[in-house]
C-alpha cells in the first residue's frame, strides 16, 4: 500500500504540467490525523478533480492566484 | 457479487466483550480502508472506527477509543471490531462499509459505497 | 471534530413533489461530502458521493450540490420508494461524521 492509502489522503499521484486556465477551483488541505501531508485538490473546468503537487512552483502560483482572487470577490 | 457480511453481535452484560466479524466477497480486500458504523434503536448512524489497507492505520471516535480495536487480517478477507469495556450506550446494530472509490489516477474519495446487512449487539444486565 | 447538522429532521411530501433537504458543516469541508439513503430495518445506501455526483445505479431525480459549509439533497420528483431518512456526511477528516438524519415521510 502506498504511504497514501495507509493514511486517508486523497492524493495518491499528483498530476505534473496542469494549465492553469483548465482549473476551476482549488482546495488545500493541511496535514491532520487523517493524512500526514498538505493536498493539494484542483477541480478542473470539466469537473473532474485533479491532485497538484504542493512543492511546485507553478502551483505556488496557482494557489496563490486563486487565493487572491476569492478575496478580491 | 461484492458482499460484506457481519457476524458476532450478541447479548452482553455491561464491562463484558465482544468480537465482532466481517467477512468480505466479490472485491480485493486488501486495497481498500474498511469501517464500523453502528445505530442505536432510533436513533441515527455514528461512525466508529476504520481502518486502512494493510492494517497500518486504524482511527476512532472519541467514544470508543482505548476501549474498542478495529483490525483486519487481509488472507482471510475478513475485518473485525474487539469491543471491550462495554457500556449500555454501545447498544446498537454494527455495520461493516467498504469504503470505495478511486475517481481519477491523481484523485481518491473515501465512500461507503458497499455495506453489511448489520449485527444487533446489546449491552444490558 | 466536525458538527453536520441536517435540516429540517422529518419533512412531509406527497408522490410528485421536488424535495430539498440541507446539511450544513461547521467549518469548510470542501466538496468532502456524501449522502446515504435507509430505509427501516436496512443498511444505508451510498446516493450521492463528492457532494454532487451520483452513484451508479441510483435514479437521476436525485442531485446533490453545494461546497465549503453549505449543501443540499434533492429529489426532483418523489417516488414511493423515496420515502426514507437521508443522511449527510463528511470526510474532510477523522473522526467522520454523520448528520443527524431527515425522515421523509408520505404526506
Known amino acids: 500500500a502506498s504511504v497514501a492509502t495507509e493514511l486517508r489522503c486523497q492524493c495518491l499521484q499528483t498530476l505534473q504540467g496542469i494549465h492553469p486556465k483548465n482549473i476551476q477551483s482549488v482546495n488545500v488541505k493541511s496535514p491532520g490525523p487523517h493524512c500526514a501531508q498538505t493536498e493539494v485538490i484542483a477541480t478542473l473546468k470539466n469537473g473532474r478533480k485533479a491532485c497538484l503537487n504542493p512543492a511546485s512552483p507553478i502551483v505556488k502560483k496557482i494557489i496563490e492566484k486563486m487565493l487572491n482572487s476569492d478575496k478580491s470577490n | 457479487e461484492v458482499q460484506l457480511l457481519e457476524s458476532g453481535g450478541g447479548l452482553v452484560q455491561p464491562g463484558g466483550s465482544l468480537r465482532l466479524s466481517c467477512a468480505a466477497s466479490g472485491f480485493t480486500f486488501s486495497e481498500l480502508s474498511m469501517s464500523w458504523v453502528r445505530q442505536a434503536p432510533g436513533k441515527g448512524l455514528e461512525w466508529v472506527s476504520a481502518i486502512s489497507g494493510s492494517g497500518g492505520s486504524t482511527y476512532y471516535a472519541d467514544a470508543v477509543k482505548g476501549r474498542f480495536t478495529i483490525s483486519r487480517d487481509n488472507s482471510k478477507n475478513t475485518l473485525y471490531l474487539q469491543m471491550n469495556s462495554l457500556r449500555a450506550e454501545d447498544t446498537a446494530v454494527y455495520y461493516c462499509?467498504?469504503?470505495?472509490?478511486?475517481?481519477?489516477?491523481?484523485?481518491?474519495?473515501?465512500?461507503?459505497?458497499?455495506w453489511g446487512q448489520g449485527t444487533p449487539v446489546t449491552v444490558s444486565s | 471534530d466536525i458538527q453536520m447538522t441536517q435540516s429540517p429532521s422529518s419533512l412531509s411530501a406527497s408522490v410528485g413533489d421536488r424535495v430539498t433537504i440541507t446539511c450544513r458543516a461547521s467549518q469548510s469541508i470542501s466538496d468532502n461530502l456524501h449522502w446515504y439513503q435507509q430505509k427501516p430495518g436496512k443498511a444505508p445506501k451510498l446516493l450521492i458521493y463528492d457532494a454532487s455526483n451520483l452513484e451508479s445505479g441510483v435514479p437521476s431525480r436525485f442531485s446533490g450540490s453545494g461546497s465549503g459549509t453549505d449543501f443540499t439533497l434533492t429529489i426532483s420528483s418523489l417516488q414511493p420508494e423515496d420515502f426514507a431518512t437521508y443522511y449527510c456526511q463528511q470526510y474532510y477528516s477523522t473522526p467522520l461524521t454523520f448528520g443527524q438524519g431527515t425522515k421523509l415521510e408520505i404526506k
Open positions: 462499509a467498504r469504503e470505495g472509490g478511486r475517481l481519477e489516477p491523481y484523485y481518491y474519495y473515501y465512500a461507503m459505497d458497499v
